[in-house]
């Protein structure tokens, strides 16, 4: 008995393969600065990079600004949104701004979207400073099903900071659903 | 045939060991209050605790304020930075403050550094309040290679809150690179 | 030798089972709007949902607002706290508000509690705006032992936003302790 029996060899590899988990889904998506909507109303951000700079995606799909889940699981979701304004860009849309982010889940099973996370602040940017800046970060752990889509809505999209380190969102799968 | 053949025993344990993943790299580093730079300019924070209170590190290395990656992988990085000022400490550096954090990646191979994440806010702390406080949180999922280093830069370091629950950064490996 | 020897069968399954990690502990707890304390002092939030909407819990226990760890491990902890005020609700508790969150660890063995994370901001909400809003997010990686409990303290609880996407905290186990 000098080796692994033929019958067992497959199982061996199977178990070993199972021991090394397959690559889990993830995404880190950065804002596409060339395609930020104007205005001060609340909008869905529909243009994100997935393959340049820090942006990356695996076992998830990006389409029309929505991050689509391909694999059931528990995911950690996060978003970082930066707003900025320099007086050289003209005046801000209003003295009192609501700078907000909503991380939203949509699905063919649900006719409206559902806010998973929100964050933000009201700001008075009418002051004497020539530059204004504000960032929001949200994160949370959610059960997501294949076919569900995650998107990001913001108020005052014209004030978004277009840098890849400033405005991004992402997800990574932490574990399976039982 | 009453036991596991000697030849197989190693493989058995190997597979079993592989089944139980080895401890993944992580770090949670808290600010060293004794060594916070003064001034209002942007600086790299070069002194962090790694082994007292909540601070800890495993399979990563801390050197001169930089958190060095020893193992390729996808990591979740985060930072929490608190700024505070009490009127008993004298006046703030300026009426309009930019309270900012930058989480930065550098590599021995490439001398330049790259901002992975940023956050913050402009603040007017010249008001009638005797105490001012503001916190920033950022987090994101990044591919890091062995030898790359993560550091934290802030503006107005003299305003940093030195508590371990206030000013910290960290990382934990989520998964391997393919 | 046409199959797996009886003696080995258990080991086979064991290894295979070990290959598929058991469900790790996690919780995502959302504020119970019906039970938010009044006042402007600092309080522990003692009423959270664990089983409706986005709220969920597994292999952890919620009791009297405290999230109890049942399994030693390294956990990522997070909290998102939103404060808001509309002028129709009357005036704010003070011109200058400290809007703060503290994520706290207590242990049955040690009666004292320890702040793991804090965040927040001082705010002047006495301005001309009819609506005010502000959110805080904190997160970090901590070693937790079975029997330890995590809770959330906030200042100005009467200003909390009661939406499930606004005010929540959570945890998920990332890895074992060696």
């Amino acid at each position: 008995f000098s080796g692994v029996p033929a019958m067992m060899e497959g199982s061996w590899l199977d178990v070993a393969r199972r021991g090394k988990p397959e690559a889990q889904p993830f995404a880190h998506l950065t804002i596409n600065a060339a395609d930020i909507p104007s205005g001060s109303h609340k909008v869905s951000l529909s243009s994100w990079y997935h393959d340049r700079g820090w942006a990356k995606i695996s076992n998830m799909t990006l389409s029309n600004g929505k991050l689509r889940v391909n694999q059931d699981g528990f995911y950690y979701l996060y978003a970082n949104i930066c707003f900025r304004h320099h007086e050289t860009s003209g005046s801000v849309p209003a003295d009192y701004l609501q700078l907000m982010v909503y991380v939203v889940k949509t699905s063919i099973k649900i006719p409206s979207s559902h806010n998973l996370m929100k964050g933000g602040s009201t700001k008075n940017w009418s002051g004497n400073s020539e530059f204004h800046f504000y960032s929001i970060n949200v994160g949370g752990f959610f059960k997501l099903r294949a076919g569900e889509e995650i998107s990001v809505q913001v108020s005052n999209p014209s004030l978004l900071d277009p840098d890849q380190d400033a405005t991004y969102f992402g997800a990574f799968k932490v574990q399976d659903i039982d | 045939f009453s036991g596991v053949p000697a030849m197989m025993e190693g493989s058995w344990l190997d597979v079993a060991r592989r089944g139980k993943p080895e401890a993944q790299p992580f770090a949670h580093l808290t600010i060293n209050a004794a060594d916070i730079p003064s001034g209002s300019h942007k600086v790299s924070l070069s002194s962090w605790y790694h082994d007292r209170g909540w601070a800890k590190i495993s399979n990563m290395t801390l050197s001169n304020g930089k958190l060095r990656v020893n193992q390729d992988g996808f990591y979740y990085l985060y930072a929490n930075i608190c700024f505070r000022h009490h009127e008993t400490s004298g006046s703030v550096p300026a009426d309009y403050l930019q309270l900012m954090v930058y989480v930065v990646k550098t590599s021995i191979k490439i001398p330049s550094s790259h901002n992975l994440m940023k956050g913050g806010s402009t603040k007017n702390w010249s008001g009638n309040s005797e105490f001012h406080f503001y916190s920033i949180n950022v987090g994101g999922f990044f591919k890091l290679r062995a030898g790359e280093e993560i550091s934290v830069q802030v503006s107005n370091p003299s305003l940093l809150d030195p508590d371990q629950d206030a000013t910290y950064f960290g990382a934990f490996k989520v998964q391997d690179i393919d | 030798f046409s199959g797996v020897p009886a003696m080995m069968e258990g080991s086979w399954l064991d290894v295979a089972r070990r290959g598929k990690p058991e469900a790790q502990p996690f919780a995502h707890l959302t504020i119970n709007a019906a039970d938010i304390p009044s006042g402007s002092h600092k309080v522990s939030l003692s009423s959270w949902y664990h089983d409706r909407g986005w709220a969920k819990i597994s292999n952890m226990t919620l009791s009297n607002g405290k999230l109890r760890v049942n399994q030693d491990g390294f956990y990522y902890l997070y909290a998102n706290i939103c404060f808001r005020h509309h002028e129709t609700s009357g005036s704010v508790p003070a011109d200058y508000l400290q809007l703060m969150v503290y994520v706290v660890k207590t242990s049955i063995k040690i009666p004292s509690s320890h702040n793991l994370m804090k965040g927040g901001s001082t705010k002047n909400w006495s301005g001309n705006s009819e609506f005010h809003f502000y959110s805080i997010n904190v997160g970090g990686f901590f070693k937790l032992r079975a029997g330890e409990e995590i809770s959330v303290q906030v200042s100005n609880p009467s200003l909390l936003d009661p939406d499930q996407d606004a005010t929540y905290f959570g945890a998920f186990k990332v890895q074992d302790i060696d």
């Epitope: 909008v43 529909s46 389409s63 029309n64 006719p111 409206s112 076919g147 | - | -």
Partner: antibody, heavy 121, light 107 residues
Framework: QVQLVQSGAEVKKPGSSVKVSCKAS????????IEWVRQAPGQGLEWMGV????????NYNEKFKGRVTITADKSTSTAYMELSSLRSEDTAVYYC??????????????WGQGTTVTVSS | DIQMTQSPSSLSASVGDRVTITCKAS??????VAWYQQKPGKAPKLLIY???YRYSGVPSRFSGSGSGTDFTLTISSLQPEDFATYYC?????????FGGGTKVEIK
């Protein structure tokens, strides 16, 4: 401008099938869901089903399950609704409508002009 | 399924009148309610979304209110072109459901 144009009126025999088309223009077809709603003569509005044209995901009203099939052709920006085993009570005007998910209001706008389907022996 | 009960089913009014139509949901639907106007032989047109937001191009005389289970569409001063049938619709959950309609006729 944003428009949904439906195929023309149909007269069908009981037991047969009908396939109504809805051609979208003026917007990115895959960005928005297409819902199908019908209205029997002198009656109210009844939802039949929905498709995500980007992926082909569908969701149907239980009442029509097994009889209705909604599809989409991205290349022509056209959605289709097929209803089989027709009976006289299926006589109605069939509408397609776009569900706006981009602005966070999820109501139906615009609607197609409607396709009258008459089921008669 | 969520029932949307609309009342009245019809009403007669004159130009300049203030008209109120109500809709009651059988369960909490938040503010996920829309109102549509439909004229004979035409497709419905969106007037109000999210219970109280007027759709672009809709005259300011149309307003919506309510949340949870009780919703109202108000026409502050009825105009000749407003004689039509009005439907409420919930989009809290599938299947989408509509009220039975309110026909606004000339007195």
């Amino acid at each position: 401008q944003v428009q949904l144009v439906q195929s023309g009126a149909e007269v069908k025999k009981p037991g047969s099938s009908v396939k109504v088309s809805c051609k979208a223009s003026g917007y990115a077809f895959t960005n928005y869901y297409i819902e199908w709603v019908r209205q029997a003569p002198g009656q109210g509005l009844e939802w039949m089903g929905v498709i995500n044209p980007g992926w082909g995901d569908t969701n149907y009203n239980e009442k029509f399950k097994g009889r209705v099939t909604i599809t989409a052709d991205k290349s022509t920006s056209t959605a289709y609704m097929e209803l089989s085993s027709l009976r006289s009570e299926d006589t109605a005007v069939y509408y397609c409508a776009r569900r706006d998910t981009a602005h966070g209001y999820y109501a139906l706008d615009p609607w197609g002009q409607g396709t009258t389907v008459t089921v008669s022996s | 399924d969520i029932q949307m009960t609309q009342s009245p089913s019809s009403l007669s009014a004159s130009v300049g009148d203030r008209v109120t139509i109500t809709c009651k949901a059988s369960q909490n639907v938040g503010t996920n309610v829309a109102w549509y106007q439909q004229k004979p032989g035409k497709a419905p047109k969106l007037l109000i979304y999210s219970a109280s937001y007027r759709y672009s191009g809709v005259p300011s005389r149309f307003s919506g209110s309510g949340s949870g289970t009780d919703f109202t569409l108000t026409i502050s001063s009825l105009q000749p072109e407003d004689f039509a049938t009005y439907y409420c619709q919930q989009y809290w959950d599938y299947p989408l459901t509509f009220g039975g309609g309110t026909k606004v006729e000339i007195k």
